[in-house]
Every structure is written in C-alpha cells, then in structure tokens.
C-alpha cells in the first residue's frame, strides 16, 4: 500500500497537493472518499489527488483482506 | 470583497529580525493557501513560501536557508512571515497573495517595504 | 525548481499595435492535460495584478484584449491593441510545483 501511494503522490510536486494525496489515504469507515472529498475546499487539485489516493488506498485494503480471507480458510 | 491588509514599513539594522502581517478579511481564511514573495528595489518578483490556514502546513524557497518562517493565527485570519538575519539584500518590498484553486494569485496584500541599514 | 525565461526584457511599442512576450518554461508546466501558467501586471508602487491563469483564461474585470496561449513549455501573452494604460511590468508564474517561480519580467512602454 504504502509503495503504491508513493508512487501515486511523486507525481504530484505542489506540496498541499501531495498531503491532500496522503490524507485520502487514512482509514475512515464511516464515510465513502466522495463523502470525504466533498468537504475539501482549498480547490480541485486537492480533491483530485485525495480521491484518486483514497480509492486506490480502499482498493488496496479490500484486496488484501480478501487475500488474508482465503488464507485463512 | 476579498482584502489582504499588509503591516507598515519597517527599518531594520542588519543581523535583526522583521515580522511582517498580512490580515486577509471577506472570504473564509481556512479555504485558501496564503504565499509570500518579495520584490528588490528594480528587481522581479522572488517567491519566498507559504502557508495551508487550515491544516499549518508550510513549504518555503530553499534560497533562504531557514531564515524564513511562516505563520498563521485562524482567530484573527492574519499570516505572518519573519525573516532573521537580515542583510542588506534583503531590502525590498514583501507581498502576500492568496492562492486560489492551488493554481493562481488572486488577490495580493498592498505591500510592506523593509530596509535594511546600518 | 522550474526556471521560466521571458522575453523580451522590454518592447515599445505604439498604440494600437500588437505587443508579444514570450515565456519558455525549463520543464513542461503541464499536469495531466491542465497548464499551470499564470501572468500578471505591475504598475509602479502597486502590487501584481492578475490577468491570465491556466495559460488563457482571462481574470475578471481583465480587458478582452489580453490573451494567453501555449502548452508545455512555450507560453505567449498578447496585447492587442496595445492601449496608453498598459504600461507596465509583465510576469508569468508557474503554479505546477515548489517553488513557485516567477519569469524575469517584460518591461512594455507606449511609444
């Protein structure tokens, strides 16, 4: 996960656009990253990065508790 | 109406300090990045750093070797931006700005002029 | 850091002619299919002021005869007519990363 948002957020050289990448990244369960993003207001490039970094972070988690379910049948 | 209101001039002798604010009314503080660039006497305009409100985040111009600091208090929607060990090249006029949409200046504070002299 | 190179430093020219700067960028200030240009005008003892962001949109209030065009690296902000009121110092600005970096300036004087 941690390599993949890495890669994901080097592209993005503005710094707030980069944490705006990182902040879509921490785990919220109570909320949908659309949800999340609808409360940024610094501008696009901000939700932009967020949810492309929140999608591909939830992506990621699901994936591999997917994995960890067939393990562990 | 937006409005970026800067201190007044200020005379500094060489190796002191100088404290500059910049007091943003008429749009929500938080929402935007405030930056600070400057401009020598003739010269064209050198971006110095800025500042998110919202979350304190900051990022400045290596040029000034951390002699440039970047605050801001939310309660009273005022940036501020210090700048130690001045010398005398650091004469100029220092402006803020509003960046919108992470993309543009759109309004600027009127200026302050800081000299340096011994 | 991106270095953005105007030219020329200064241009006279006469009213209701074209006047032409140049800005070339070090690096493309494009981000998946956005520009990150901006310009500005600077009149003696007064702050910048807005005119283009995003390569060629004009900023409100912004005479319709200032345009900005280019892509990638090689920007252009026009004036045309020129009028008496645009004397002044011109700058282009990239927005795409940090530092923020200005072009050294285009003096335009009226003849």
């Known amino acids: 996960l941690q390599e993949k948002i890495e890669e994901i957020a080097a592209k993005y050289k503005h710094l707030v656009v980069k944490k705006c990448c990182y902040d879509g990244v921490r785990i919220n369960h109570d909320e949908t990253c659309e949800q999340r993003a609808a409360r940024i207001s610094v501008g696009p490039r901000c939700v932009k990065a967020f949810t492309e970094c929140c999608v591909v972070a939830s992506q990621l988690r699901a994936n591999n508790s997917h994995k960890d379910l067939q393990l562990g049948r | 109406q937006v409005q970026l209101v800067q201190s007044g001039a200020e005379v500094k002798k060489p190796g002191s300090s100088v404290k500059v604010s910049c007091k943003a009314s008429?749009?929500?503080?938080?929402?935007?990045?405030i930056h600070w660039m400057r401009q020598a006497p003739g010269q064209g305009l050198e971006w110095m750093g800025y500042?998110?409100?919202?979350?304190?985040?900051?990022n400045y111009n290596e040029n000034f070797k951390g002699r440039v600091t970047i605050t801001a208090d939310k309660s009273t929607s005022t940036a501020y931006m210090e700048l130690s060990s001045l010398r005398s090249e650091d004469t100029a006029v220092y402006y803020c700005?509003?960046?919108?949409?992470?993309?543009?200046?759109?309004?600027w504070g009127q200026g302050t002029t800081v000299t340096v002299s011994s | 850091d991106i270095v953005l190179t105007q030219s020329p430093a200064s241009l006279a020219v006469s009213p209701g002619q074209r006047a032409t700067i140049t800005c070339k960028a070090s690096?493309?200030?494009?981000?998946?299919?956005?520009?990150?240009m901006n310009w500005y005008q600077q009149k003696p003892g007064q702050p910048p002021k807005l005119l283009i962001y995003?390569?060629?949109n004009l900023d409100s209030g912004v005479p319709a005869r200032f345009s900005g065009s280019g892509s990638g690296t090689d920007f252009t902000l026009t004036i045309n007519p020129v009028e008496a009121e645009d004397t002044a110092n011109y700058y282009c600005?990239?927005?795409?990363?940090?530092?923020?970096?200005f072009g050294g300036g285009t003096k335009v004087e009226i003849k």
């Open positions: 700005a509003r960046e919108r949409n992470l993309e543009y200046f759109d309004y």
């Open positions: 008429g749009y929500t503080f938080t929402d935007h990045i």
């Open positions: 500042i998110y409100p919202r979350e304190g985040w900051t």
């Open positions: 690096q493309s200030v494009d981000f998946e299919g956005d520009n990150y």
């Open positions: 995003a390569t060629s």
């Open positions: 600005q990239q927005s795409l990363e940090d530092p923020h970096t």
